[in-house]
Interface confidence: medium
Amino acid sequence: AGVFELQIHSFGPGPGPGAPRSPCSARLPCRLFFRVCLKPGLSEEAAESPCALGAALSARGPVYTEQPGAPAPDLPLPDGLLQVPFRDAWPGTFSFIIETWREELGDQIGGPAWSLLARVAGRRRLAAGGPWARDIQRAGAWELRFSYRARCEPPAVGTACTRLCRPRSAPSRCGPGLRPCAPLEDECEAPLVCRAGCSPEHGFCEQPGECRCLEGWTGPLCTVPVSTSSCLSPRGPSSATTGCLVPGPGPCDGNPCANGGSCSETPRSFECTCPRGFYGLRCEVSGVTCADGPCFNGGLCVGGADPDSAYICHCPPGFQGSNCEKRVDRCSLQPCRNGGLCLDLGHALRCRCRAGFAGPRCEHDLDDCAGRACANGGTCVEGGGAHRCSCALGFGGRDCRERADPCAARPCAHGGRCYAHFSGLVCACAPGYMGARCEFPVHPDGASALPAAPPGLRPGDPQRYL
């Protein structure tokens, strides 16, 4: 167990041209606050996936009133740290999202309004117990400077907060096989704890790193209740008379999801699927409009008729959910025949067929390519009684004997210039883009190219939003 701490040093316009104006309207004073979301590992997780390591919201900063015409200064910040407690081991590698929100003040009907100013995200390696790490991130024309660290809560120590320290039982030395606890030399290292995440209620260990389950529980972390088909009694403790194992109380018992959200159990706890207009761990945050950017993954937001349907997200292919937050796993339907490999590209489904098969779903059994020669490194592809050559870069024609113009298909995105090269093609990218095909913006705009904003926050205790 421990705490991840984040200290925001400054938020303001970044260097270079295009510095933003003040984020406050001349009409409405405003103040800033920050939200941090942590996820374990270095995976490229979508912005809307749960903050599995935890999340925190800062206090509101001082009120800032724009001086008309003045450029945006570094804006006044909230006091104090953002602290995200973690219960299990510190993973060592983590992903973060830090959002800067603007709260508009004034005499607005319906109270203050919130809007997302900037979102930065990154993936880092960090050992618990180490010094503060400093970072600078840019979102569009904004720049955020911050420091962070992970520290263990006593009695946990170590880079993952998995070692425990206890006061010495004897004044002179630690017990057999146990070392003094640096830097707490007057304490001794306790035996290593059970496997990270092992249920404290239903699991135990006799060897460091293991997780053995009490009767009635199973799974690698002892979080899954055992059920037997012969037992029809309701949830409750194991019945001594029948010998039945009956699952204990589940994380979805009593439905922790508010506002009509539906609960589903996950290996570690539960997940709420929220109805439109609500979000948050327990669907507790409401009052979302299109201005809050509630549609993820490029979903199109359309204003709804009333507060119960304040917006509707029209999802692009490959995404679903009231906020387009769920990727449709179309490969789970196993659409590719004859052992083909399914690839869900988001905008489309592709089947990569095994040799000897072709077609959109690998449904065609092809003729043999034996004895057919494709020149210049081309490969023979079977198909409908005739062979076809898949030519290497720079060649074309039926047998790959003709030189092809690799630039003919206009492969360079965003206005990049294409140049034929002996090894294929080279893209000279337009200003602001990079990548082999100029497909990546160099400085993605904070509002549009970054992942979509979560729905707007609403008045109340900031802790509600976690």
């Epitope: 104006r21 309207s25 001349a26 409405l28 008309p68 015409g69 005499d107 607005q108 009907i109 201005a291």
Partner: antibody, heavy 117, light 107 residues
Framework: EVKLEESGGGLVQFGGSMKLSCAAS????????MDWVRQSPEKGLEWVAE??????????YYPESVKGRFTISRDDSKSRVYLQMNNLRAEDTGIYYC????????WGQGTLVTVSA | DIQMTQTTSSLSASLGDRVTISCRAS??????LNWYQQKPDGTVKLLIY???RLHSGVPSRFSGSGSRTDYSLTISNLEPEDIATYYC?????????FGGGTKLEIK
Amino acid sequence: EVKLEESGGGLVQFGGSMKLSCAASGFTFSDAWMDWVRQSPEKGLEWVAEIRNKANNHATYYPESVKGRFTISRDDSKSRVYLQMNNLRAEDTGIYYCTGYSSFAYWGQGTLVTVSA
Amino acid sequence: DIQMTQTTSSLSASLGDRVTISCRASQDVINYLNWYQQKPDGTVKLLIYYTSRLHSGVPSRFSGSGSRTDYSLTISNLEPEDIATYYCQQYSERPYTFGGGTKLEIK
């Protein structure tokens, strides 16, 4: 029901003065920021003055075109906002609307001000 | 000053049509944009504030969208009472400025 009612408009000589009044009802006037907006065929809709609430020290703001000639004021006890216009010019001719709240949520029916040469 | 431009000064549409009116700002107005409806009798009503937030009492067939310098008002199902002139206005920076208006007529 929210209601804003302007009065005091009419015909005035070039260089003359006029005071417009706006009576408000149906909302908490003392909380509201109040504005005057005018409309003419030549210039369309044009913001003229803003006065904030007591919490904002009744701060006032004007565009350059009327600064020094127009003064906005308010009387929270009477739920009224005023626009004192001095040194009037031909380009000040138009319908003057009283509007309330920072989002310009509520508008009156307007009162016509005509400045003659 | 920030200039607000409504390129279409008049628009003709049929009842039931989906109508979109656009507005462009000379610089980023950071979503501080309102849409108003002015009826032929001069009555002015706020429809949308802060780009897309529907003012209370406004029918849901009205919606707003946009960001930075480009904004639009959409009427999803045109009704007879929607015949009016529509104005955009920025309140990001003083002086607060209005577009020239788009007059909507029935075919």
